[in-house]
């Protein structure tokens, strides 16, 4: 069976395809190879002899036990090798030879027994190493690691270390990687040697399900003392073994590191007291909490010295009280518990993200909800009932404005954004808004896009209530169930390049509305149920249109609009997926191409 | 279309058939059976994937005695600091894992339930697997 | 399952009136778009007429135009088609259509009505 040709003379997918040895039947020019899945069993010399250019190659599982010197010889392109699942027993000195470009190695679950003898000390442009899954016992660092100067991710996950010495990081001492980010998770760990990390500077530490009791974990924590990292991962994952008790004392010894950001992934237990749990942690940049539950939802109030506060999917008995005078960001999402929110204190707060919470708004939005006047990026995405009973009084500095999805009151009873000169981006998507009122987006005259998706209009119908977006350059009015507009819609809209009508219930296309559109180069009119055009000729749309979407539509394929039919034909340049164009009526042409018509009139009158 | 036997317990019996054409062997093993009445245990899961698990979620299509519920979207791997540790299993790397599961006070109705699981993955997206699951339900009182 | 029952059809002199009725049944047809169709002795389906859920877009086909009006009463889950100034030519089979809640065109099809225009 030959292998897909995914992009031709470039990519190649042969995976699963029962070789037995590397096939010769592919051009010289391959770029990216995926061998995944195949019987190969031996790599001897030169085994790619054919494929000079080769970037990527994927060799996951295919059953290869040995692997001679020289196999990857003549690889000088290659970037990413992937040898995923081969339960390598034989590997040459010289294996990894002539791989002078490689960044990526993965050999995950290759009965990887050492580092020391894993024949890559010449890969000097190496940037990730991942040697997760393997059966590694000692994490000492081989002196070669000090050749890696560009190494970056270092992934020993899933591995047997259960102890790490002073002298394992020694070669880190003489040529710190300042860049180097660390996985350790899934280590069984029960010793780290005081002054092991001493002076140590990397990236990211990662550290889950590493500890099998409180105690270990408070002991190994304390071997870290010394180290300056910049991002460190600390928790557990919900399908591995938990710590049955978690108290303050587990995170003591992290007074003893430097960080910059700190985050607890998962934990199957209750947070009680934060303010001592997290008390080495007060003056962290950035702090996070994925998948956790928090009962004293108070203690947010202490004085943290955060810059950014993260609570992703965690459990909530109330929505929490948060006063944090240094706070610029704060995310807040997929969180359950603490439906209704509540104000905020967040003085400095320039970026919020409460999307995804379920949580409803009694009344929203102005400065005192949110304590803050420097908010630029608001996402209120994917939430419940929000009410607008302000106009964004105090949020004036607002750039980016997000509701989409949640379920939006009052949105037609004043203009409920005169505030926002400043706002770029606004989605109204799928809100439940329906529009009634001309001046709903009256004080966006900074706005650049505009998508009120899944919305609807008074009576079907379009007004003229986009007069003061004179920088609008996206709008997305799909499924908005419109059906006819005001000539004068899109008058004002001269920088417009993007118009999304898809997904309306128009009957029949007219151009006079596009006419000032001196910029739009899409305009979707997909998804709708035109027939036909509307009375008069119809003249041409703006020339800087590029692409135009007339698909999915109910086209008329008979005489009597024969004039509408041959226009279509002169749009042909424009016209995106004309495959897609099919006639609805009359019944025996109903399913032909538009564009395969011959349009004389012997068509049935 | 073979038909894979997973489980019998007091009020249902479960069995799970291919719904592509790959049909890459999985191993699903559950612990004790699940009852709907309530139930907890683990379940066990084996198996080798033929590409990533990063961003790996369910798309859900539920039938209850032949009426359609609306799709379900479970969202499994986010894609960064994942719970589950699978989340950043490999292609072709063997994934053997178990996962505690526990629900109570939900009352079904007897009959068929079928559960079409279609897992898509990867960026881009693709699909990993389609099982489609039968839980005949045979409630002892309802 | 969707069923559509036109009825109204009939022999009319040329010049004469009809009104054409359909009723949707088995759920509410309220916002989709519906309309008639008409199929002559040895001619193809055709559009006649077409609404908008709201009645506020309608189509008719040119032949038609003026002497043909489409409406509906939504609360009786009705189309009508009013027909005025009949001629022989529109002797046909009248067919009632209405596009599915998710908006595909044309998806549910009535039996029929029988309208002869006798000269």
């Known amino acids: 069976e030959p292998c897909v040709e995914v992009v031709p003379n470039i990519t190649y997918q042969c995976m699963e395809l029962n070789f037995y040895k590397i096939p010769d039947n592919l051009p010289f020019s391959t770029k990216n190879l995926d061998l995944s899945f195949n019987p190969l069993r031996h790599l001897g010399s030169y085994s790619f002899f054919s494929f000079p250019e080769l970037q990527v190659l994927d060799l996951s599982r295919c059953e290869i036990q040995t692997i001679e010197d020289g196999a990857y010889q003549s690889l000088s392109h290659l970037s990413t090798l992937i040898l995923t699942g081969n339960p390598i027993q034989s590997l040459a000195l010289g294996a990894f030879s002539g791989l002078s470009s490689l960044q990526k190695l993965v050999a995950v679950e290759t009965n990887l027994a050492s580092l020391e003898n894993f024949p890559i000390g010449h890969l000097k442009t190496l940037k990730e190493l991942n040697v997760a899954h393997n059966l590694i016992q000692s994490f000492k660092l081989p002196e070669y690691f000090s050749n890696l100067t560009n190494l970056e991710h270092l992934d020993l996950s899933s591995n047997k270390i259960q102890s790490i010495y002073c002298t394992d990081l020694r070669v880190l001492h003489q040529m710190p990687l300042l860049n180097l980010s660390l996985d350790l998770s899934l280590n069984p760990m029960n010793f780290i040697q005081p002054g092991a990390f001493k002076e140590i500077r990397l990236h990211k530490l990662t550290l889950r399900n590493n500890f099998d009791s409180l105690n270990v974990m408070k002991t190994c924590i304390q071997g870290l003392a010394g180290l300056e990292v910049h991002r460190l991962v600390l928790g557990e994952f919900r399908n591995e073994g938990n710590l049955e008790k978690f108290d303050k004392s587990a995170l003591e010894g992290l007074c003893n590191l430097t960080i910059e950001e700190f985050r607890l992934a998962y934990l199957d237990y209750y947070l009680d007291d934060i303010i001592d749990l997290f008390n080495c942690l007060t003056n962290v940049s950035s702090f996070s909490l994925v998948s956790v539950t928090i009962e004293r939802v108070k203690d947010f109030s202490y004085n943290f010295g955060w810059q950014h506060l993260e609570l992703v999917n965690c459990k909530f008995g109330q929505f929490p009280t948060l006063k944090l005078k240094s706070l610029k960001r704060l995310t807040f999402t997929s969180n359950k518990g603490g439906n209704a929110f509540s104000e905020v204190d967040l003085p400095s707060l320039e970026f919020l993200d409460l999307s995804r919470n379920g949580l409803s708004f009694k009344g929203c939005c102005s400065q005192s909800d949110f304590g803050t006047t420097s908010l630029k990026y608001l996402d209120l995405s994917f939430n419940g009932v929000i009410t607008m009973s302000s106009n964004f009084l105090g949020l004036e500095q607002l750039e980016h404005l997000d509701f989409q999805h949640s379920n939006l009151k009052q949105m037609s009873e004043f203009s409920v954004f005169l505030s926002l000169r400043n706002l770029i981006y606004l989605d109204i998507s799928h809100t439940h808004t329906r529009v009634a009122f001309n001046g709903i987006f009256n004080g966006l005259s900074s706005l650049e896009v505009l998508k009120m998706a899944g919305n609807s209009f008074q009576e079907n119908f379009l007004p003229d209530i986009f007069t003061e977006l004179r920088n609008l350059t996206f709008l997305d009015l799909s499924q908005c169930q419109l059906e006819q507009l005001s000539p004068t819609a899109f008058n004002s809209l001269s920088s417009l390049q993007v118009l999304n009508m898809s997904h309306n219930n128009f009957f029949s296309l007219d151009t006079f509305p596009y006419k000032c559109l001196n910029s739009l180069q899409v305009l979707d009119y997909s998804l709708n149920h035109i027939m036909t055009s509307k009375k008069q000729e119809l003249q041409h749309f703006p020339s800087s249109l590029a692409f135009l979407n007339l698909t999915q539509n109910d086209f008329a394929c008979t005489c009597e609009h024969q004039s509408f039919l041959q226009w279509i034909k002169d749009q042909r340049q424009l016209l995106v997926e004309v495959e897609r164009m099919e006639c609805a009526t009359p019944s025996d042409k109903q399913g032909m191409p538009v564009l395969s018509l011959n349009i004389t009139c012997q068509m049935n009158k | 279309q073979k038909q894979y036997w997973v489980c019998n317990s007091s009020d249902a019996s479960i069995s799970y058939t291919y719904c592509d054409k790959m049909q890459y062997p999985i191993s699903i093993n559950v612990n004790p059976c699940i009852e709907l009445k309530r139930s907890k245990g683990l379940l066990h899961i084996f198996y080798i994937p033929r590409r990533d698990l990063k961003q790996l979620y369910f798309n859900l299509y539920i039938t209850v005695n032949t009426m359609n519920l609306p799709k379900r979207k479970e969202v499994i791997c986010r894609g960064s600091d994942d719970d589950y540790s699978f989340c950043r299993a490999l292609k072709g790397e063997t994934v053997n894992t178990t996962i505690s599961f526990s629900f109570k006070g939900i009352k079904f109705s007897k009959g068929k339930y079928k559960c079409v699981v279609e897992a898509i993955s990867g960026s881009p997206e693709e699909m990993l697997f389609c099982l489609e699951f039968v839980i005949l339900h045979q409630p002892n009182s309802n | 399952e969707v069923q559509l029952v036109e009825s109204g059809g009939g022999l009319v002199q040329a010049g004469g009136s009809l009104r054409l009725s359909c009723v949707a049944s088995?759920?509410?047809?309220?916002?989709?778009?519906m309309g008639w169709f008409r199929q002559a002795p040895g001619k193809e389906r055709d559009i006649v007429a077409r609404?908008?859920?709201?009645?506020?877009?309608?189509y008719y086909a040119e032949s038609v135009r003026g002497r043909f009006t489409i409406s509906r009463d939504n609360a009786k889950n009705t189309v009508y088609l009013q027909m005025n100034s009949l001629r022989p030519e529109d002797t046909a089979v009248y067919y009632c259509v209405a596009d599915s809640p998710g908006g595909r065109s044309y998806e549910y099809w009535g039996q029929g009505t029988q309208v002869t225009v006798s000269s």
């Open positions: 609404i908008s859920g709201s009645s506020i877009s309608t």
């Open positions: 088995g759920r509410t047809l309220s916002t989709v778009n």
